[in-house]
């Protein structure tokens, strides 16, 4: 999905009312210096590209986050938010269902997170230049 | 240009009713998601209730459930909030605010309905004053 055409203002707004209040909780007794950020984005539509990549792939060590609240109102904002977004989700979602797991907070699904909280970070400041 | 413009405020006593409504000029309602929000002093805006005009999906706020009824008629402008039962904790100002993407995600829409800073545009607002 090419994220050029999101409102982006209204999924900044999105994150900071609620977003990133469950990314908080998630990672709650995790120090904030625990994690070093390897994943970084140039600008806002690459930045919900690796937003949407890390939320919904599983990875090793980390099967999946989608049932995650945070990632619950990352999709419904990607959504509503991003024309035609939810079209094509359709055959990821069913494909999601046949694989799903039961929830498992893993270290390594923490430092997943604390990857995500700083894409987001830098999504929302988009005039910011890369280091 | 677009406007919003509430009416139906005013003073009532514990237990009584009054019915806000919403009217918009400049833009259609049409597939908007339209909130009624309300702000008393020293106080954060909250959102209260909320209509998708496209499937006419409703949302409301805890405190409101049951006794809070928002609508829109055929022409799905205006829109009315019918407040029954009111306590004098429901003083407060009312707005209406619509949004455009919103209304057509109705179902997506249940994490985000409540929060003031992702609506487009705002009605002036009208009081509402609940005696004891």
């Known amino acids: 999905y090419d994220f050029t055409n999101c409102d982006f203002e209204k999924i900044k707004a999105a994150y900071l009312s609620t977003i990133s209040k469950d990314l908080i909780t998630y990672m709650s007794g995790t120090k904030s210096t625990e994690f070093n950020n390897t994943v970084s984005c140039s600008n806002r539509p690459h930045c919900l590209t690796e937003i949407q990549s890390l939320t919904f792939n599983p990875t090793a060590g980390c099967a999946s986050l989608a049932k995650e609240m945070f990632a619950m109102k990352t999709k419904a904002a990607l959504a509503i938010w991003c024309p035609g977004y939810s079209e094509t989700q359709i055959n990821a979602t069913q494909a999601m269902k046949k694989r799903r797991k039961r929830k498992v907070t893993t270290n390594k699904c923490l430092e997943q997170v604390s990857q995500l909280q700083g894409l987001w970070r830098r999504f929302n400041r988009p005039l910011l230049k890369q280091q | 240009q677009v406007q919003l413009v509430e009416s139906g405020g005013g003073l009532v006593q514990a237990g009584g009713s009054l019915r806000l409504s919403c009217a918009a000029s400049g833009f259609t309602f049409d597939d908007y998601a339209i909130t009624w929000f309300r702000q008393a002093p020293g106080k954060e805006r909250e959102g209260v209730a909320y209509?998708?005009?496209?499937?006419?999906?409703?949302y409301y706020a805890d405190s409101v459930k049951g006794r809070f009824t928002i609508s829109s008629d055929n022409a799905k402008n205006p829109v009315y909030l019918q407040m029954d039962s009111l306590k004098p904790e429901d003083t407060a100002v009312y707005y209406c605010a619509a949004e455009g993407r919103m209304g057509t995600h109705s179902r997506d829409s249940v994490y985000f309905w409540a929060f003031s800073a992702l609506y487009d545009y705002w009605g002036q607002g009208t009081q509402v004053t609940v005696s004891s």
């Open positions: 209509i998708s005009n496209n499937d006419g999906m409703t």
